[in-house]
Interface confidence: medium
């Protein structure tokens, strides 16, 4: 059989070899496709509901005005010429549809080195047959289950059109000390040969290297954080890292609207200053690193103060509810 590929929705003409160019003709077409239960016979006389799907042209060819998925199958023509010589034509028809350009959705802008990260999900819609999605790093194919690469794939079929939607989610574990701006792309390869791959626009997430920092120390004066009304409390955030990181302050987890500073002075303490304080050190190349939380409280004369560094308070909270 001769292999024929036809694009879904396009017309298709199949020649009946050996048939006289015009009537009278002795020929018949036999079809075994998704539209037929077994072999369906079509003659030049035609007529009936099949004419909208396939009909025999005056020259004996079979004409399909718009090929669909159900037209995949075997088409055979048997013709006899004026001298009584019989000729057979045999076609294997396969249909295809090229999807739209694949896209990467839910893409990460930043990855963390040394841990698994979701890079994004590649989506291709409207293909037939299904085809495949593959990922590339800096132009080279990524092999799933190798070097911290994993891919989760899903194929769905549209209940009415029969076309496929493919999804591929890429997870990678970037190596420490590797490329800080890797380039990822995804490509769709059609299920039928001779059609070129379609590639997404590339994405370039940053890779963040978490560097273990020495601990951030929060020093409270007076020790224990208990002070009489009107007294002063000094909080000092000590970070051994060089160059010195920026220091932000939190009260009850609420970011305090203050310029970055390693020292926070609470003069003339009142009830509104009571709460849980911590500092956050942010270095340009590291993530934020917070100190322990310490409790600041007011004691009336004769009261015992709480122990140093008791953790509690009411929340990384309400500033900048943008």
């Amino acid at each position: 059989a001769q292999n024929i590929t036809a694009r879904i929705g396009e017309p298709l003409v199949l020649k009946c070899k050996g048939a006289p160019k015009k009537p009278p003709q002795r020929l018949e077409w036999k079809l075994n496709t998704g539209r037929t239960e077994a072999w369906k016979v079509l003659s030049p006389q035609g007529g009936g509901p099949w004419d909208s799907v396939a009909r025999v042209l005056p020259n004996g060819s079979l004409f399909l005005p718009a090929v669909g998925i159900q037209d995949e199958g075997i088409f055979r023509c048997q013709a006899m010429n004026r001298n009584g010589k019989e000729t057979k034509s045999n076609y294997r028809v396969r249909v295809y549809q090229i999807p739209g350009k694949p896209e990467i959705v839910d893409s990460a802008s930043e990855l963390t080195a040394g841990v698994p990260n979701k890079v994004g999900t590649c989506v291709s819609e409207g293909s037939y047959p299904a085809g495949t999605l593959s990922w590339h790093l800096d132009g080279k194919p990524l092999v799933p289950n190798e070097k911290g690469v994993s891919v989760k794939e899903q194929t769905r079929r549209h209940p009415e059109t029969g076309l496929f939607t493919l999804q591929s989610e890429l997870m990678v574990t970037p190596a420490r000390g590797g490329d800080p701006r890797p380039t990822f792309s995804c490509s769709f390869s059609p299920g039928l040969p001779r059609h070129r791959a379609l590639r997404t626009a590339p994405i370039q997430p940053r890779v963040w290297e978490p560097v273990p920092l020495e601990e951030v120390q929060l020093v409270v004066e007076p020790e224990g954080g208990a002070v009489a009304p009107g007294g002063t409390v000094t909080l000092t955030c000590e970070v051994p890292a060089q160059p010195s990181p920026q220091i932000h302050w939190m009260k009850d987890g609420v970011p305090l609207p203050l310029p970055p500073s390693p020292v926070l002075i609470l003069p003339e303490i009142g009830p509104q200053d009571q709460g849980t304080y911590s500092c956050v050190a942010t270095h340009s190349s590291h993530g934020p690193q917070e100190s322990r939380a310490v409790s600041i409280s007011i004691i009336e004369p004769g009261e015992e103060g709480p122990t140093a560094g008791s953790v509690g308070g009411s929340g990384l909270g309400t500033l900048a509810l943008a």
């Epitope: 839910d106 963390t112 963040w208 917070e290 939380a293 900048a320 943008a322």
Partner: nanobody, 117 residues
Framework: AVQLVESGGGLVQAGGSLRLSCEVS????????VGWFRQAPGKEREFAAA????????YYAASVKGRFTISRDNAKNTVYLQMNSLKPEDTAIYYC??????????WGQGTQVTVSS
């Protein structure tokens, strides 16, 4: 862009429990502190709980302390809010928010929690 998606809300009877999840995508998860906020009908949005970058520090509003527990799973890019002994006054839309350094820059769409008496 960083995206936050809350789930786990629903209808529960007073005294019951729910676990809310907040999945953070599009950024290095361990760079974000995450907070839960809630907004009851006709009221201002209020802070409920938060967890710091490392998970070492947790914070709670007085109204939920002892009943709610916040935790994070850095492998799953998810923060959880376990809510026990729920009361009708806990009925609200619960939002999660992510903080890079000093403000909550990114917000989810919210999940509805309804506690019936």
């Amino acid at each position: 862009a960083v995206q936050l998606v809350e789930s786990g809300g629903g209808l529960v009877q007073a005294g019951g429990s729910l676990r809310l999840s907040c999945e953070v995508s599009g950024g290095a998860f361990s760079r974000y502190a995450v907070g839960w906020f809630r907004q009851a009908p006709g009221k201002e949005r209020e802070f409920a709980a938060a967890i710091s970058w490392s998970g070492n520090n947790t914070y709670y509003a007085a109204s939920v302390k002892g009943r709610f527990t916040i935790s994070r799973d850095n492998a799953k890019n998810t923060v959880y809010l376990q809510m026990n002994s729920l009361k009708p006054e806990d009925t609200a839309i619960y939002y999660c928010a992510a903080m890079l350094v000093s403000t909550y820059d990114y917000w989810g769409q919210g999940t509805q929690v309804t506690v019936s008496s």
